[in-house]
C-alpha cells in the first residue's frame, strides 16, 4: 500500500490585503483513518487556521465540497487577507485516536507573504 | 462489481476461539478502511472493530478480546474472536468504509454475513 | 459515546403513503449521519450519508434532511420493497460508530 504523503505544492503564496488566498493541500492515500486540519506555524504555540469537525473559522472555507466521498483534496481559502496573517501555513494529518487524535504526518508548508499592491 | 464474502462462522463454547475472514473484491482493497459491525439476534446494528493502514479501533465491549486484522496481499479482512461470551452471539458482517466531511466513515457495502453462535 | 435514538420503533404505512422516520442524537454530529435499510436475511444497505446525500442507485424517493442533533428520513410514497428496518449511524465522534435502535417499517 501506498505511504500518506502530504502535497503543498506551493512553497510561497503571494497575496493581496483585502483578497482571498487558497491553499492547496492534497494527500495521495486515505489512510490512516483521522482528519486533516490547517495550522499557521509550528510547535505548541501553533495557530489553528481550520478544523471542519468543530470550531468557528467565518474566513475560512474548503475548495473541496464537504459531502464528497473519499475526499484527497484539503485544499481551503481564506477570505479579506490582512497583514497578521502572514507565515507559513501546514496541513497536517491526525491518525484517529481515542480520545485524542494523534499527529501523523505534516505538508511541508506553504508561506504566505505580501506582494505588491496592483497598481 | 464491489463484494464482500464473509466465512469463518460456526457453533463454540464459550470461552472458546474462532476466526472469520472477509475476502474483498471489485475496489483497490488497501485504500480503504474496513470494518466489521455485528447483529445479534432480532436486534439492531452494533459496530465492533475498524482498521485502517496499521491503525485499529474496538468496541469496548471486545476490546482485549478481539483482533483485528488484514493481508492486503489477499484482499482480506479477518477478525480473531477469543474468550467468547453468550453475547457474542450474532450475524458478523464485514463492510467497505467510505470517508466524507474530510474524516468520517460510513458503509457503503456490506458483505452478507456470517453466524457466530457461542453455546454450550 | 453519542447515542442515536429512533422514533418510532414501527410505523405502519399504506402502500403509497408518505412515511417519516426520525434520528435524535444525543450531542450535535453535525451532518455526519447515515441511513441504511434492512430487509430479513440480508445485510443494511446505504441509503443515505452527509444527512441528505442520496446514494448512487437509491430511488428519489428516500430523502434525508436534518442536522445537529435532529435528523428525519422521508419515504415519499411507500413501495412495496420499502417495508424494512432502517437504521441511523453517526460517524461525527468516534470511536465507537453508533447506530439507531432501527424502525420498522410494516405494511397497514
Known amino acids: 500500500e501506498e505511504e500518506l504523503q502530504m502535497i503543498q505544492p506551493e512553497k510561497l503564496l503571494l497575496v493581496t490585503v483585502g483578497k482571498t488566498a487558497t491553499l492547496h493541500c492534497t494527500v495521495t492515500s486515505l489512510l490512516p483513518v483521522g482528519p486533516v486540519l490547517w495550522f499557521r506555524g509550528v510547535g505548541p504555540g501553533r495557530e489553528l487556521i481550520y478544523n471542519q469537525k468543530e470550531g468557528h473559522f467565518p474566513r475560512v472555507t474548503t475548495v473541496s465540497d464537504l459531502t464528497k466521498r473519499n475526499n484527497m483534496d484539503f485544499s481551503i481559502r481564506i477570505s479579506s487577507i490582512t497583514p497578521a496573517d502572514v507565515g507559513t501555513y501546514y496541513c497536517v494529518k491526525f491518525r484517529k485516536g481515542s480520545p485524542e487524535n494523534v499527529e501523523f504526518k505534516s505538508g511541508p508548508g506553504t508561506e504566505m507573504a505580501l506582494g505588491a499592491k496592483p497598481s | 462489481e464491489v463484494q464482500l464474502l464473509e466465512s469463518g462462522g460456526g457453533v463454540v463454547q464459550p470461552g472458546g476461539s474462532l476466526r472469520l475472514s472477509c475476502a474483498a473484491s471489485?475496489?483497490?482493497?488497501?485504500?480503504?478502511?474496513v470494518t466489521w459491525v455485528r447483529q445479534a439476534p432480532g436486534k439492531g446494528l452494533e459496530w465492533v472493530s475498524t482498521?485502517?493502514?496499521?491503525?485499529?479501533y474496538y468496541a469496548d465491549s471486545v476490546k482485549g478480546r478481539f483482533t483485528i486484522s488484514r493481508d492486503n496481499s489477499k484482499n482480506t479482512l479477518y477478525l480473531q474472536m477469543n474468550s467468547l461470551r453468550a453475547e457474542d452471539t450474532a450475524v458478523y458482517y464485514c463492510?467497505?468504509?467510505?470517508?466524507?466531511?474530510?474524516?468520517?466513515?460510513?458503509?457503503?457495502?456490506w458483505g452478507q454475513g456470517t453466524l457466530v453462535t457461542v453455546s454450550s | 459515546e453519542i447515542v442515536l435514538t429512533q422514533s418510532p420503533a414501527t410505523l405502519s404505512v399504506s402502500p403509497g403513503e408518505r412515511a417519516t422516520l426520525s434520528c435524535r442524537a444525543s450531542?450535535?454530529?453535525?451532518?455526519?449521519l447515515a441511513w441504511y435499510q434492512q430487509k430479513p436475511g440480508q445485510a443494511p444497505r446505504l441509503l443515505i450519508y452527509?444527512?441528505?446525500i442520496r446514494e448512487t442507485g437509491i430511488p428519489a424517493r428516500f430523502s434525508g434532511s436534518g442536522s445537529g442533533t435532529e435528523f428525519t428520513l422521508t419515504i415519499s410514497s411507500l413501495q412495496s420493497e420499502d417495508f424494512a428496518v432502517y437504521y441511523c449511524?453517526?460517524?461525527?465522534?468516534?470511536?465507537?460508530?453508533?447506530f439507531g435502535g432501527g424502525t420498522k417499517v410494516e405494511i397497514k
Open positions: 471489485g475496489f483497490s482493497f488497501s485504500n480503504f478502511a
Open positions: 482498521i485502517g493502514s496499521g491503525d485499529t
Open positions: 450531542q450535535n454530529v453535525k451532518n455526519d
Open positions: 449511524q453517526q460517524y461525527y465522534d468516534w470511536p465507537p460508530f453508533t
Open positions: 452527509a444527512a441528505r
Open positions: 463492510a467497505k468504509d467510505s470517508t466524507v466531511s474530510w474524516s468520517g466513515d460510513f458503509f457503503d457495502y
